[in-house]
């Protein structure tokens, strides 16, 4: 029950996170005009990954897309790439995790397969979240650098009567959305990985019991199951049965997760 809850919660948290990453990527407010020196401005500038916008006091908003690819800063291109990779990985992770959910039954899918899918989606969510956090952090670093550069420029060359005020940009809402969304996706991914451990069939050193109809004696076959450590060739938690000779009327017991010996 706890495993199902952890997996379900991980899925929901990741879903919210990825929706947030998509929203942040599409948002225009990655950087907004710094209003420290002029808290009330008649023309307000803000920029996103794909276009820059100007909102006038009149209410008129004009947005212009970055129609060039080669002319854009390499850092901006890197941020775009990180966010897109994050979205793609997250989307694939969501798709995989839907099929991995314990509450959804698809054919005769084994718990081991669901465990693997849960782990895969969890890793994808973790990488997706890290991509988003990295992308937003790179952009934030770029803003901080430019902010202090423009602050330095602002106080140079003001000897004349005419002032040329340089527009400075600060953190926009999209950065905070991105950080939170990336964090949620990361948390969701960790939860999926935790759920995966609970989904994987537990390894006990079960004893295979051989029943003989004719005889009164019961023959025990010690070491009938080889305990798997999770490493080596037995990574998929498959039971390895010994190839001992059995009579036709021998009853085989396949212990499942809920069998108690």
């Amino acid at each position: 029950m706890a495993v199902t809850a952890c997996q379900g919660l991980g899925f929901v948290v990741s879903l919210i996170g990825i929706a947030g990453i998509i929203a942040a990527t599409c948002m225009d407010q990655w950087s907004t005009q710094d209003l420290y020196n002029n808290p009330v401005t008649a023309v307000f500038n803000y920029q996103g990954l794909w276009r820059s916008c100007v909102r006038e006091s009149s209410g008129f908003t004009e947005c212009r897309g970055y129609f060039t690819l080669l002319g854009l800063p390499a850092m901006l291109q890197a941020v775009r790439a990180l966010m897109i990779v994050g979205i793609v990985l997250g989307a694939i992770g969501l798709l995989v995790s839907i099929f991995a959910l314990k509450c959804i039954r698809i054919g005769s899918m084994e718990d081991s397969a669901k465990a693997n899918m849960t782990l895969t989606s969890g890793i994808m969510f973790i990488v997706s979240g890290l991509c988003a956090i990295a992308g937003v952090s790179v952009f934030a670093n770029m803003l901080v650098t430019n902010f202090w550069m423009s602050t330095a420029n602002m106080y140079t060359g003001m000897g004349g009567m005419v002032q040329t005020v340089q527009t400075r940009y600060t953190f926009g809402a999209a950065l905070f959305v991105g950080w939170v969304a990336g964090g949620l996706t990361l948390i969701g991914g960790v939860m999926m990985c935790i759920a995966c451990r609970g989904l994987a069939p537990e390894e006990t050193n079960y004893k295979a019991v051989s029943y003989h109809a004719s005889g009164h004696s019961v023959a025990y076959k010690p070491g009938g199951f080889k305990a798997s450590t999770g490493f080596g060739s037995n990574t998929k938690n498959k039971k390895i049965y010994d190839g001992g000779a059995r009579t036709e009327d021998e009853v085989q017991s396949y212990p499942s997760k809920h069998d108690y010996v």
Epitope: N45, V54, S58, G59, E62, V162, T164
Partner: antibody, heavy 118, light 113 residues
Framework: QVQLVQSGAEVKKPGASVKVSCKAS????????INWVRQATGQGLEWIGE????????YYSEKFRGRVTLTADTSISTAYMELSSLRSEDTAVYYC???????????WDQGTTVTVSS | DIVMTQSPSSLAVSLGEMATINCKSS????????????LTWYQQKPGQPPKLLIY???TRESGVPDRFSGSGSGTDFTLTISSLQAEDVAVYYC?????????FGQGTKLERK
């Protein structure tokens, strides 16, 4: 067509208050910002302030802050400008104007003459 | 506050001749975000409210004759009337529409010579 119609001329005593109205028609009142500008006889134009009818946000010129109050009644598409503590130098023609893209005032009313005299 | 300075304060031009009015701002009116200059030109005839002529320094308002043109960037702007007509006799104002408070130039009185 777009029209801005103001209230009639006012004669006030120093220290009194005046409230000028500006009724808009021919467009969606809440979609445009209303600006107030005054012009003393033979003088230039002087910006008083602006109001965003949708949210009621106001911005005032520092010169008039504390003395002027801009309001809007969206139900009757009317903007108001109230100027208190009137003095003789407040004698002027008061205009309301609609703000459009480029922060330009495209439609102006005919103006309300406010005379402050003892 | 941004100070707007117009020159000349009055100008007499013959009909059919070109008229040029200058406007200088104490601060740049060029917005880096959209590369537009937030300068507006108005025409005011006696006993009438001002009329919008040009916004964004060079964009002519609809219905304004094409003899009116605006130019300039940053801090220096010009309103040009290519061929003066009798109905163009008026006072012309430039306005900072970039920052609060919106400020107007003192006006240029255009007369017929």
């Amino acid at each position: 067509q777009v029209q801005l119609v103001q209230s009639g001329a006012e004669v006030k005593k120093p220290g009194a208050s005046v409230k000028v109205s500006c009724k808009a028609s021919g467009y969606t009142f809440t979609s445009y910002v209303i600006n107030w500008v005054r012009q003393a006889t033979g003088q230039g134009l002087e910006w008083i302030g602006e109001i965003h009818p949708r949210g009621g946000n106001t911005y005032y010129s520092e010169k008039f802050r504390g003395r002027v109050t801009l309001t809007a009644d969206t139900s009757i598409s009317t903007a108001y400008m109230e100027l208190s503590s009137l003095r003789s130098e407040d004698t002027a023609v008061y205009y309301c104007a609609r703000l459009r893209r480029g922060n330009a005032m495209d439609y102006w009313d005919q103006g309300t003459t406010v005379t402050v005299s003892s | 506050d941004i100070v707007m300075t117009q020159s000349p304060s009055s100008l007499a031009v013959s009909l059919g001749e070109m008229a040029t009015i200058n406007c200088k701002s104490s601060q740049s009116l060029l917005n880096s975000g959209n590369q537009r200059n937030y300068l507006t030109w108005y025409q005011q005839k006696p006993g009438q409210p001002p009329k919008l002529l040009i916004y964004w320094a060079s964009t002519r308002e609809s219905g304004v004759p094409d003899r009116f043109s605006g130019s300039g960037s940053g801090t220096d702007f010009t309103l040009t009337i290519s061929s003066l007509q009798a109905e163009d006799v008026a006072v012309y104002y430039c306005q900072n529409s970039y920052n609060y408070p919106y400020t107007f130039g003192q006006g240029t009185k255009l007369e017929r010579k």
